[in-house]
């Protein structure tokens, strides 16, 4: 059997379990930042012809190892939910990053022949919906 | 996502078995008695972020584009090894009213890791 180790994620109370899985736990420093980026800046303008730019979100901020006060210790009826860090193992530092499974695609119009013909495509996993310390 | 094999220090998924008995939760968790939770570990050098196969690839590519050119605010943004795919797991447990509950708990198992 495995030696006693700290739970890899913050334990959470039953009320946290009941909320939508995609809702990240609030963290003081980890947040989502918006930035307007043009495909020209990226050098993708020969491929992506529309939109010319898009709102890019990224995750930014620090992730302390403290357990927020709204997260109680495991009690009967409080199943583990990785609402907070996913990797709080000895030596592992949580990171402010996009919550897995919540990235969204961007729908774009593309060309591969210099603008003679167009195609509608999706750029996968480009838009960050939620950030969390993971 | 890479599986950690001890030979590389690049971002990978490390096998980790959680025994509910070991962490003192077996008094209220009926089943399973434990499971492979796994976690992410390893380095994220700039050439790794945004590599194809990562579910964060396009997002990481954009950040990397600016980071490698030293542009603010991405210059100091650290790429780190994080779960990119998580899986739910069915659990049977007693709630605080001692009712027996079967529930699919989201995000219990780390399936894949990648560089943010």
């Amino acid at each position: 059997s495995t030696p006693l180790m700290s739970w890899p994620w913050s334990p959470s109370a039953l009320r946290l379990l009941q909320r939508p899985p995609e809702e990240p736990a609030a963290h003081a420093n980890c947040h989502r930042v918006a930035l307007n980026i043009s495909f020209q800046e990226l050098g993708w303008e020969r491929w992506i012809v529309y939109p010319p730019s898009f709102i890019f979100h990224y995750c930014h901020g620090g992730c302390g190892l403290h357990i927020p006060p709204n997260l109680s210790l495991p009690v009967p009826g409080a199943p583990p939910t990785p609402a907070q860090p996913y990797s709080l193992l000895p030596g592992a530092q949580p990171c402010c990053a996009a919550l897995p499974g919540t990235m969204r695609p961007l729908h774009v119009r593309t060309t591969s022949d210099g603008g003679y013909s167009f195609k509608y495509e999706t750029v996968p996993n480009l838009l960050t919906q939620h950030c969390a310390c993971i | 996502g890479l599986e950690c094999d001890g030979k590389v220090n690049i971002c990978c998924k490390k096998q980790f078995f959680v025994s509910f008995k070991d962490i003192g939760w077996n008094d209220w968790i009926i089943a399973p008695s434990g499971y492979h939770a796994n976690y992410c570990e390893g380095e994220c050098p700039s050439h790794i972020a945004g590599t194809s196969g990562s579910s964060l690839s396009f997002h990481s590519t954009v950040i990397n584009h600016y980071r490698m050119r030293g542009h603010s605010p991405f210059a100091n943004l650290k790429s780190c090894c994080v779960p990119t795919k998580l899986r739910p797991m069915s659990m049977l447990y007693y709630d605080d009213g001692q009712n027996i509950i079967k529930k699919d708990i989201q995000n219990m198992i780390v399936e894949e890791c990648g560089c943010s």
Epitope: - | I30, A31, S33, S90, K102
Partner: antibody, heavy 118, light 107 residues
């Protein structure tokens, strides 16, 4: 391969108790639950309860609460089901089954016929 | 407890026929449903779990569908060895409950 071997048929008098055994092989005993399901002659299947050797928990259907006891012996990889205060309505075939997933019974024992008659 | 209602209670069919058995749950059980086959004097055998996943070793003529409250077990081309009783069972919540069974007999 995974096997569940049950004890032999029993004939009991009303008011008595019966203890049925289920010896497992082919997998790690503590990794899966054992459910007990009964079937009265010409009737359907009825879940009685389950034992979770890994965690030591037992859960029983309300109908059998107080009358059934499920135990385990991890040294012999054997699960037991004891039913007390037997009535003629308890005449049935009693099956043990492994739970592959929670409440899904993927491998079954051959059954133990229990007859309650005065 | 969740009630499981199977229909029909019996069906007469010939070898090669397509047979459909339905199962209705008294509340939403998503896809937490299993189907079992039981031959006379034998133990039940798991055919399908998670409403549509075929258990290892079960012939592909068996298929399951449905989610929520309405489920179906289909035998695409009935074989002689398929004449048996079939039971659905919900695995969504405690306690697990079985349908009353459907007897598939030779016409």
């Amino acid at each position: 391969q995974v096997q569940l071997v049950q004890s032999g048929a029993e004939v009991k008098k009303p008011g008595a108790s019966v203890k049925v055994s289920c010896k497992v092989s082919g997998y790690t005993f503590t990794s899966s639950a054992i459910s007990w399901v009964r079937q009265a002659p010409g009737k359907g299947l009825e879940w009685m309860g389950g034992i979770y050797p890994g965690s030591g928990h037992t859960i029983y259907a309300q109908k059998f609460q107080g009358r059934v006891t499920m135990t385990e012996d991890t040294s012999t990889d054997t699960a037991y089901m004891e039913l007390s205060s037997l009535k003629s309505e308890d005449t049935a075939v009693y099956y043990c089954a492994r739970e592959g997933d929670i409440f899904v019974m993927d491998v079954w024992g051959l059954g133990t016929a229990v007859t309650v008659s005065s | 407890d969740i009630q499981m209602t199977q229909s029909p209670s019996s069906v007469s069919a010939s070898v090669g026929d397509r047979v459909t058995i339905t199962c209705r749950a008294s509340m939403d059980i998503r896809n937490d449903l299993a189907w079992y086959q039981q031959k006379p004097g034998k133990a039940p055998k798991l055919l399908i779990y998670d409403a549509s996943k075929l258990e290892t070793g079960v012939p592909s003529r068996f298929s399951g569908s449905g989610s929520g409250t309405d489920f179906t077990l289909t035998i695409s081309s009935l074989q002689p060895e398929d004449f048996a009783n079939y039971y659905c069972q919900q695995a969504k919540s405690f306690p697990p409950t079985f349908g009353g069974g459907t007897k598939v007999e030779i016409k």
